[in-house]
């Protein structure tokens, strides 16, 4: 069965046959235990791993340092992978990242880099990334220059304030930052003049929270 | 429509501190961005450094860390910025604009009239 | 930090074309902001996001953008028009301005 095959993540599955989107199991390095993850096998030529998915406000991303680590929420629905099993994948080669938007008004755009990983938990999962491109803004809405992973109970920016508090969810903050996608989900007509929404500076503005969002990994030599 | 009303003229000796305030009215003023951008005479505009109030965290160009301190009272939608060690070089016209949002890397959609600072012994 | 390249004077007659360029290595990847200003007046925002322009501003105002240089483009360039212009960019937490380039209307 496709479950017991070695799959180090979505590029091995869709390598060996599988193309349809859907969950699958993976087996990472330096993990005891496998993970089911959605793979999207649509996008830009497949092979993609989701580590994050937004679509609905059914679940809660306002959670702590732990609940982060380790992930939370359905990888059939919204989810975080996990910064554990994101640093994991990310250590065993090179990979790219995949950021897909879409606003209240079915407009989709998307950012890509180039370069894609984090460090490990005494690093504050620190995020480093390269070579920006995309539809979501010429600029990056990613601090390039690498920020570290904050929650509501670590706080690890670099503003006085807390960002992650003031600004919901779990994120990269920089102080605050142009993004967080693991803000507060606003339903249309409610979405604008939000600070603490779902943000991507360079696609809709500081204040707009965004509908979907979906951020995907894959090798660089897929 | 948000304006940005500045303090009047100022007459420093070398050595002193001069601050400016910088008053907004008819909007946000805490999730914005104000910079401070100043403009020596017959000379291009210079960023000095901005604060977003609602994060309260400021940030300085390198050429003026250790000599300016921006800070903001949100009861007062107020913002200021403050030059210490004035040389003449100083002299300039300084002037508070926001930017369009709780970022740095934005356009600065809105500007104060000026503050005229003159630094002579 | 980085720095932002402007001629620094550009002449034109009435109801010609002028093009003011800004050149910078970060400019691929950063937005470019340009800045109309008038002698003894505060800076104005002509054209944002390498090509958008604000409300209120004249269609004659344009602006594009190829790899490391960006150019403001004012077509039918009229007596008002003459001013000092600015080309600025930013990243996250620090912001550039050009050094300025003088528009100067013949006749």
């Known amino acids: 069965r496709e479950e017991e095959k070695p799959f180090r993540d979505c590029a091995d599955v869709y390598q060996a046959g599988f193309n349809k989107s859907g969950i699958y199991t993976i087996y990472i390095n330096n993990m005891p235990e496998p993970k089911k993850v959605f793979c999207n096998m649509d996008v830009n030529g497949g092979g993609w791993t989701v580590i994050q998915h937004r679509e609905d406000g059914s679940l809660d991303f306002q959670r702590g340092w732990k609940e982060y680590k380790m992930g939370f929420g359905n990888p059939s629905g919204e989810y975080w992978l996990g910064n554990e099993f994101i640093f994991a994948i990310t250590s065993q080669r090179q990979y790219m990242l995949r950021i897909e938007l879409m606003d209240w008004e079915g407009n989709r755009a998307y950012s890509q880099y180039d370069r894609f990983h984090i460090g490990n938990e005494k690093q504050n999962y620190r995020l480093y990334l390269k070579g920006h491109t995309g539809t979501a803004g010429k600029q990056s809405s990613l601090i390039l220059h690498g920020a570290d992973f904050s929650t509501k109970d670590a706080d690890n920016d670099n503003c006085m304030c807390k960002c992650a508090l003031m600004l919901t969810g779990g994120w990269w903050f920089d102080a605050c930052g142009p993004s967080n996608l693991n803000g507060m989900f606003y339903t249309a007509g409610q979405n604008h003049g939000k600070l603490n929404g779902i943000k991507w500076h360079y696609f809709k503005g500081p204040s707009y929270s965004l509908r979907s969002t979906t951020m995907m990994i894959r090798p660089l030599d897929f | 429509q948000v304006q940005l009303v500045q303090s009047g003229a100022e007459v420093k000796k070398p050595g002193a501190s001069v601050k400016v305030s910088c008053k907004a009215s008819?909007?946000?003023?805490?999730?914005?961005?104000i910079s401070w951008v100043r403009q020596a005479p017959g000379q291009g505009l210079e960023w000095m450094g901005g604060?977003?109030?609602?994060?309260?965290?400021?940030n300085y160009a390198q050429k003026f860390q250790g000599r300016v301190t921006i800070t903001a009272d949100e009861s007062t939608s107020t913002a200021y910025m403050e030059l210490s060690s004035l040389r003449s070089e100083d002299t300039a016209v300084y002037y508070c604009?926001?930017?369009?949002?709780?970022?740095?890397?934005?356009?600065?959609?809105?500007w104060g009239q000026g503050t005229m600072v003159t630094v002579s012994s | 930090s980085y720095e932002l390249t402007q001629p620094p004077s550009v002449s034109v007659s009435p109801g010609q074309t002028a093009r003011i360029t800004c050149s910078g290595d970060?400019?691929?990847?950063?937005?470019a902001y340009w800045y109309q200003q008038k002698p003894g007046q505060a800076p104005v925002l002509v054209i944002y996001?390498?090509?958008e322009r604000p409300s209120g501003i004249p269609e004659r105002f344009s602006g594009s953008s190829s790899g490391t240089t960006v150019t403001l483009t004012i077509s039918g360039v009229q007596a008002e028009d003459e001013a000092d212009y600015y080309c600025?960019?930013?990243?996250?937490?620090?912001?550039?301005f050009g050094g300025g380039t003088k528009l100067t209307v013949l006749g």
């Open positions: 600025q960019s930013a990243d996250s937490s620090h912001v550039v």
């Open positions: 996001k390498d090509s």
């Open positions: 970060a400019l691929p990847k950063q937005y």
């Open positions: 008819g909007g946000t003023f805490s999730s914005y961005a």
């Open positions: 604060i977003i109030p609602i994060f309260g965290t400021a």
């Open positions: 604009a926001r930017f369009e949002s709780g970022y740095w890397g934005d356009a600065f959609d809105i």
